[in-house]
Each structure stands twice: as structure tokens, then as C-alpha cells.
Interface confidence: low
């Protein structure tokens, strides 16, 4: 396995609508035509897969229809957006990038982006 550097922001604050976006950038060691991006969530020493997409360079990322993730790619950057987040989803979101084709296979794992999610305050009861 060939190691590859992956960079991502240290901290991101989700919007009041529970949406968080961040850029995952990888240092491609060569010409890659097929790339797989996986978002992992680490919380309480547990790591779970949030979403994953394989894309051909120059094409859009395609996540599963029921995925909470969307994304776009531009060169060696992937712009990831995670939706539907709640306070309980606060945690470290790790970007894993695999250059699937052509060989040799490269794997890169970022240090993670700490996403803070604050549930919005409920609206006060109105008298009118």
C-alpha cells in the first residue's frame, strides 16, 4: 500500500439547519482516474462509516440515494457536505481517500475534522 497525504480542516461548526461542509484535499502521487472517498466518524473510540462514494475524475461524486452526504470534486479536492446533523452527531469526521485506478493503489487518511453540532433553541411560545 502506498501512503498518500490527505488534508482537511481541524474544526467545522454545523449550521443551524444541521449542515456541515468541509474540503478534503489529497496529494495525488500520479494520474488517478478512479477515486473512492469515505467519511468515517470517530466518537468514543468507535469508528463508523458515514458515507462513501466512488467517482471518475472529472465526474460528480455519487453517493447512495439515502446518504446524508453530498459532494463535488475539483482536481485533487473533494467538497463534502453532511446533512441532517444533530447535537448527538458531534464528533471527529475523518476523510479517507483511495486512488483505485490506475495502479499502484494509494490510500490516504486525514487527521479528521471535528464537527460541532448545536441543536437550535426551540422557538418560545407566542401569545399572538
Amino acid at each position: 500500500c502506498k501512503a498518500m497525504h490527505v488534508a482537511q480542516p481541524a474544526v467545522v461548526l454545523a449550521s443551524s439547519r444541521g449542515i456541515a461542509s468541509f474540503v478534503c484535499e489529497y496529494a495525488s502521487p500520479g494520474k488517478a482516474t478512479e477515486v473512492r472517498v469515505t467519511v468515517l466518524r470517530q466518537a468514543d473510540s468507535q469508528v463508523t462509516e458515514v458515507c462513501a462514494a466512488t467517482y471518475m475524475m472529472g465526474n460528480e461524486l455519487t453517493f447512495l440515494d439515502d446518504s446524508i452526504c453530498t459532494g463535488t470534486s475539483s482536481g485533487n479536492q473533494v467538497n463534502l457536505t453532511i446533512q441532517g446533523l444533530r447535537a448527538m452527531d458531534t464528533g471527529l469526521y475523518i476523510c479517507k481517500v483511495e486512488l483505485m485506478y490506475p495502479p499502484p493503489y494509494y490510500l490516504g487518511i486525514g487527521n479528521g475534522t471535528q464537527i460541532y453540532v448545536i441543536d437550535p433553541e426551540p422557538c418560545p411560545d407566542s401569545d399572538f
Partner: antibody
């Protein structure tokens, strides 16, 4: 039907060069890596290197870097391997082999082999 | 470079026997391993890829297993046409080295 057809057997003198061809048909030549493999008489298989015909990017086994040049002609869907400064130990059967496009990889189609005999 | 140690180098067996060939790479291949069959005077033929996936048209008596640094090719019931030489190959970064081969002969 995918086919890889290699050039015929050759007898060459020590010190000479030879160019072996591999004509591909039945698939999109520019979207697959083409590999070359050596098999000396009675011995095993050795990976020489590969070329991606779309832009002629090559990856070569360092053990063959001073011996082999790999090229490809997109217009004729043909891959070539040139062997230089031939010696008796270069006597072998040389195969071309297509590599599958997705991970996990494999060599799915092979040419019939070209016998190169180096002798004075 | 990754070294591929294949064993045994030769093997005598009878029709109907169950045969196992082992391949041990010098480092973890993460199942990026293929098996080929070669008969005298012929090009190698793909049997399995990704350690366990049967190639198109290959009989189900052939199977592959393993992970990490330990891989196995099994022929559940030898047929006359199975007597040949078998090679493993890693495809985990270049150079894509092969095992030294296992020659399967009739007992």
C-alpha cells in the same frame, strides 16, 4: 471478443535489439493497462512493466529498466516492447497481458506469447 | 519489492484428489492477489482474482481463500485437465511479482 495477437518468434544475435508487438482487438485499447511478462525456458513468470495507451504512461520493473522500452500506438491498437543489447539470458517467451480496469486487479487476457531466441 | 513464496514447488496427485497450494507474500496484500493456471506451451489463464473471486468460465472446483500474508488455492476434486503449473501474483503496487510456481503432476 477480446484478442491479443503477438508477433512471431524471432532469432537474434547477441548485442542486437528486437521489437515485439501485441495487437489488441475487441475492446477499447486506450482504457486498459497493457502489461509485459517474461518467461525463461523452464522458469516462472516475471513482470516486466506496463503502459497505459491513452497517454503512454509507463511503469517499469526496475530490474528491466536498462533492457526494455515499452510503447503503444493508439491508431493501430498495438503495444510494443523493445529489448536492447540482447544476451543469451534474454532468451525467453514474452507475453503481453491486459489488466482489468478496477480494483482488485488481474491480468484477464493474454497474448499467445512471442519466443525470442538470442544466439550467435 | 514484495516477494511471493509459493509452496509446494511441485505436487503429485490423482484424479479426484483435493489439492491445496499456498502463497505467502512478504507483506500484507489486502487480498490483492490473483491465481493463474499455465499449461505447457500456452499462455497463463486467470483463475481467481481478489484472492477469492472466480474468473469467468472457471469451474467451481477451484476456490481461493486468505488475507494478509497467507493465501490458498484449492482444487476440490482434481480433473485430468487440471494438471498444469499454477502461479500466484500480487497486484499491490508495482512491480507485480509472481510466485515461483507449483507444478501439479499426475501420481
Amino acid at each position: 471478443e477480446v484478442q491479443l495477437v503477438q508477433s512471431g518468434a524471432v532469432l537474434v544475435k547477441p548485442g542486437a535489439s528486437v521489437k515485439v508487438s501485441c495487437k489488441a482487438s475487441g475492446y477499447s485499447f486506450t482504457t486498459y493497462w497493457m502489461n509485459w511478462v517474461r518467461q525463461r525456458p523452464g522458469k516462472g513468470l516475471e513482470w516486466i512493466g506496463m503502459i497505459h495507451p491513452s497517454d503512454s504512461e509507463t511503469s517499469l520493473n526496475q530490474a528491466f529498466k536498462d533492457k526494455v522500452t515499452i510503447t503503444a500506438d493508439e491508431s493501430t491498437s498495438t503495444a510494443y516492447m523493445q529489448l536492447s543489447s540482447l544476451r543469451s539470458e534474454d532468451t525467453a517467451v514474452y507475453y503481453c497481458a491486459r489488466m482489468g480496469r478496477r480494483n482488485p486487479y488481474y491480468f484477464d487476457y493474454w497474448g499467445q506469447g512471442t519466443t525470442v531466441t538470442v544466439s550467435s | 519489492d514484495i516477494q511471493m513464496t509459493q509452496s509446494p514447488s511441485s505436487l503429485s496427485a490423482s484424479v479426484g484428489d483435493r489439492v491445496t497450494i499456498t502463497c505467502r507474500p512478504s507483506e500484507n496484500l489486502y487480498t490483492n492477489l490473483a491465481w493463474y493456471q499455465q499449461k505447457p506451451g500456452k499462455a497463463p489463464k486467470l483463475l481467481l482474482y481478489g484472492a477469492t473471486n472466480l474468473a469467468d468460465g472457471v469451474p467451481s472446483r477451484f476456490s481461493g481463500s486468505g488475507s494478509g500474508t497467507d493465501y490458498t488455492l484449492t482444487i476440490s476434486s482434481l480433473q485430468p485437465e487440471d494438471f498444469a503449473t499454477y502461479y500466484c501474483q500480487h497486484l499491490w503496487g508495482t512491480p507485480f511479482t509472481f510466485g515461483q510456481g507449483t507444478k501439479l503432476e499426475i501420481k
